[in-house]
């Protein structure tokens, strides 16, 4: 016999070595080679069948094709291995050029040997190795990333088999229409969206392979409850109030209750009832520079939601009524009215209106005036005053004045002081 060369002898080579020269193999109950043995193919003039190939693979069958050899012969013998290691032999008429191996196991490799026979002589075998298609399988349907209106699906499936997958989404109470999706057989995930919140669903997945529909697998999913009331936002903060806004599900509420309490709990809570369609409330008439807690809750048929909460500090009040007096060539007094809320300090910034480096002076929060010095004669100055408390600053209040330019202007400057800043004084 012939021995395969190399480290490992192939199953086909081993089969040839053991059987191709041996007489009387017998059928062996269908597991051996059909018919009688032969004298072998050494020195034979028989040509090997040409271009043996597998033209089609299926789960339980393989289709073989080949070309007729030139030399005359009587018949073909086709041998193929089983997963158990046994061989099956089939005798075929000499005009045969194709054959279908049937009754095979899915996803298994098969060795095929095809020889031409004449009398007791055999050609060298043509060889081919091929695997049957894997059986289409799907499993492990998993639901993840659940939101109020969507979820993700993932699953496992035999690769390269399925043309499409069909996903059916059915709500458990059968109140909604069944939704069906058809997606590519290459996919292993799907995002399902546009679902109602707080709803139980059954998900069915099936795969479509040529002429085969697999068994359907299923999973259950429940969309999350919609956050009925959320995103409490405070905006437009000013010394006397702020704007409260929130988000809520459409038609979920009959009314909203907005409660405003000062952080020190010194004042009575203020309550505002709004219709269920409103999403905003502008609050005015609050105290400047103090903390407030805002609570928003919704009512549905008398039931109250747990409130959304936010804490806020109203903006610092700005100084008022800037007055300039005692204006000289190089100095002036600026005074103002303090805001109602207590402040730590005032910052006064002044700069020539034509430009230049601003000067700054900070005074204690109890003061309501200061003297500006080292000014340039005959120059108009822009003055800005802000109140400060900790890191918080009020909106600025501004005004302008012009320093005296010479002796003639001193009388005018004194007149400004006498007339409470009605001359050369602008509120900006």
């Amino acid at each position: 016999g012939s021995t395969a060369i190399g480290m490992k002898e192939t199953a086909a080579a081993k089969f040839e070595r053991q059987h191709m020269d041996s007489p009387d193999l017998g059928t062996g109950g269908g597991s051996g080679i059909e018919g009688r043995g032969s004298m072998g193919y050494r020195g034979s003039e028989l040509d090997t069948p040409k271009d043996l190939q597998v033209s089609e693979t299926a789960e339980t069958s393989l289709t073989l094709l080949w070309k007729t050899p030139l030399a005359k012969f009587d018949r073909y013998r086709l041998n193929y291995s089983l997963p158990t290691g046994q061989w099956v032999g089939v005798q075929l008429p000499r005009n045969t050029t194709s054959y279908v191996l049937r009754g095979l196991e899915p996803g298994q490799e098969y060795n095929v040997l095809l020889t031409a026979e004449k009398g007791r002589h055999k050609s060298k075998p043509a060889r081919v190795k091929a695997s049957t298609a894997k059986e289409p399988e799907i499993g492990n349907l998993n639901v993840s990333d659940i939101t109020p209106e969507s979820f993700n699906l993932s699953w496992m499936a035999t690769d390269g088999i399925f043309e499409t997958f069909t996903i059916e989404i059915i709500d458990s109470n059968r109140l909604l229409e069944t939704v069906e999706y058809n997606i590519s057989g290459a996919e292993r995930t799907a995002h399902i969206s546009g679902l109602p919140p707080s709803t139980d669903f059954i998900v069915y997945l099936s795969g479509l392979a040529p002429s085969i529909r697999t068994k359907t697998i299923s999973a259950t999913a429940t969309t999350e409850a919609l956050p009925l009331l959320e995103n409490l936002t405070i905006s437009d903060i000013n010394p006397y109030g702020f704007t409260v806004s929130w988000m809520a599900s459409e038609n979920a509420f009959d009314s909203f209750l907005v409660t405003v309490v000062d952080s020190g709990k010194l004042l009575d809570p203020q309550e505002f009832t709004l219709s269920g369609t409103q999403r905003k409330l502008e609050l005015r008439g609050l105290i400047t520079g103090i903390g407030y807690e805002v609570m928003v809750s919704g009512f549905t048929q008398g039931h109250q939601t747990k409130p959304l909460r936010a804490e806020i500090v109203t903006a610092m009040g700005s100084p008022k009524e800037v007055i300039f007096s005692d204006i000289t060539e190089n100095s002036a007094t600026v005074s103002w009215r303090a805001p109602t809320a207590q402040v730590e300090s005032f910052r006064i910034t002044y700069v020539p209106i034509t430009g230049g480096t601003p000067s700054m002076v900070t005074v204690d929060g109890t003061k309501t005036q200061t003297r500006l010095v080292k000014l340039i004669p005959g120059v108009e100055y822009l003055v800005s005053i802000i109140a400060m408390k900790g890191f918080e600053e009020s909106e600025p209040v501004s005004g302008s004045f012009t320093t005296a330019s010479g002796l003639n202007d001193i009388f005018e400057a004194q007149k400004i002081e006498w007339h409470e800043g009605t001359h050369h004084h602008h509120h900006h």
Partner: antibody, heavy 118, light 107 residues
Framework: EVQLLESGGGLVQPGGSLRLSCAAS????????MSWVRQAPGKGLEWVSA????????YYADSVKGRFTISKDNSKNTLYLQMNSLRAEDTAVYYC???????????WGQGTLVTVSS | SSELTQDPAVSVALGQTVRVTCQGD??????ASWYQQKPGQAPVLVIY???NRPSGIPDRFSGSSSGNTASLTITGAQAEDEADYYC??????????FGGGTKLTVL
Amino acid sequence: EVQLLESGGGLVQPGGSLRLSCAASGFTFSSYAMSWVRQAPGKGLEWVSAISGSGGSTYYADSVKGRFTISKDNSKNTLYLQMNSLRAEDTAVYYCAKTSPRVPLDYWGQGTLVTVSS
Amino acid sequence: SSELTQDPAVSVALGQTVRVTCQGDSLRSYYASWYQQKPGQAPVLVIYGKNNRPSGIPDRFSGSSSGNTASLTITGAQAEDEADYYCNSINSTRNEVFGGGTKLTVL
């Protein structure tokens, strides 16, 4: 004083119909949402249906959806529950209840017994 | 699920404090309401909102809430407090939901 008085209960065969009424007094009926709640013998409370003050919006438990209809006649200060295709499991005492804007089911009637049996 | 879960039965010695609890998804968003029902009578509202009592309800009744759990506390239980207690809330589809009820026995 708020008063709610149910009527219309009785014995009915499976598949039959019944109409319950709830006469209301002591409050502005048209301003308040109303509900029907039932209690099977020896069992807990089960909400059945609700209707808005104007009567424009209605809500139903899944167990009665498509079979029961809630309505109210604000001119007569009366709440109704039309019950069709009655089943044995609908046997219960049926209560009507008032809802205030900030207080749920704050007043209840004394109930009327509905028995569904052949 | 939109159901509310209650312990079927609770007992308390006369004058002692008892807590009846209620669990459910809707209680994450809404406060529970509590109803007292004595045999052969209609239910009576005893607590609603964060911790509000209708007029005529003794101040020994109080309510509290945390996460998906609501509690009704009776401080110094009296014989006349023996009754069934039902928690109640509402879900996102405006359906009222009730707990299965807790039978309170005063010993």
